[in-house]
């Protein structure tokens, strides 16, 4: 199911009508930080460093864009999803 | 799969509060909305308000609000809708619903909790 | 907030026959940044909670018959079931997405004639 979320959440950000998803316009690529300790498991971006980008919507990373996505709530748009609905 | 199971049927007096709970499973509670919707006997369905447990924003609806709170508990993927100051108008069958995703936006319900009956009465 | 209207409030098909619900809402639908109504119908059967049937106005979610369709744009949407059977019989509500507060219609109820 999770899978089909990414999937779905990957096409849009692809599409050619990416309003309503959105990356931030100053992509912060930088150098890549080292795996931690462990399994090596990478933490979502969008839990601290991207945590309050999207406004009325929620924050999504494509790893493949290596940016944040916002899916907005009802009535909302944009970049960050700050714009309502008129 | 996904499911959403809710708390039993409560009976309440009036000027008291009801809390019903929604626990989710099947799917990663945080990606999607949890929305609650009502149905009074023989009526139809009326939007309550919802939360979005990844970023925590709530949204109401006005005709709720003073009277409707509704949580979620990211460590064991439940959600709570708690209506206080019952009147006998609040009697209905309460669902919680997951609010899913598709082109960008949220906003249609696709699975949903068997209800729970709260009755109101003196 | 968006009133959504659906008519007939009562509808009687026989078996094997199109059965075609409408809902019309207060103001548009149509988000300007995908082109695609934010509209969604529901089916409801007695004893049990809402199904999701189409979301946009037209997309059918998984595993729904494809007897059911939905079109329309704008303000005027449509429900149609290309052939009724006898496990269609239930009430059917639309449901905006488009702003807060999110709205329903009040529903239609289909009989078998």
């Known amino acids: 199911d999770l899978q089909e979320a990414d999937l779905d959440l990957l096409r849009v950000t692809l599409s050619s009508k990416p309003q309503a998803l959105a990356t931030p316009n100053k992509e912060e690529h930088g150098k890549r930080k080292k795996k931690g300790k462990g399994l090596g498991k990478k933490r979502d971006p969008c839990l601290r460093k991207y945590k309050d980008f999207c406004i009325h919507g929620e924050c999504k990373y494509v790893k493949e864009l290596r940016a944040p996505s916002c899916i907005c709530h009802p009535g909302y748009h944009g970049e960050r999803c700050h714009g309502l609905s008129l | 799969q996904v499911q959403l199971v809710q708390s039993g049927a409560e009976v309440k007096k009036p000027g008291a509060s009801v809390k019903v709970s929604c626990k989710a499973s099947g799917y990663t509670f945080t990606t999607y909305g949890i929305t609650w919707v009502r149905q009074a006997p023989g009526q139809g369905l009326e939007w309550m308000g919802e939360?979005?447990?990844?970023?925590?924003?709530?949204y109401y609806n006005e005709k709720f609000k003073g009277r409707v709170t509704i949580t979620a508990d990211k460590s064991t993927s439940t959600a709570y809708m708690e209506l206080s100051s019952l009147r006998s108008e609040d009697t209905a069958v309460y669902y919680c619903a997951r609010e899913s995703f598709s082109d960008g936006y949220y906003g249609y319900f696709d699975y949903w909790g068997q209800g729970t009956l709260v009755t109101v009465s003196s | 907030d968006i009133v959504m209207t659906q008519s007939p409030d009562s509808l009687a098909v026989s078996l094997g026959e199109r059965a075609t619900i409408n809902c019309k809402s207060s103001?548009?639908?149509?988000?300007?940044?995908?082109?695609?109504?934010?509209l969604a119908w529901y089916q409801q059967k007695p004893g049990q909670p809402p199904k999701l049937l189409i979301y946009?106005?037209?997309t059918r979610e998984s595993g729904v018959p494809d007897r059911f369709s939905g079109s329309g744009s704008g303000t005027d949407f449509t429900l149609t079931i290309s052939s009724l059977q006898a496990e269609d019989v239930a009430v059917y509500y639309c449901q905006q997405y488009y702003r807060y507060p999110l709205t329903f219609g009040q529903g239609t109820k289909l009989e078998i004639k």
């Open positions: 103001q548009s639908l149509l988000y300007s940044t995908n082109q695609k109504n934010s």
């Open positions: 939360i979005f447990p990844g970023s925590g924003n709530t």
């Open positions: 946009w106005a037209s």
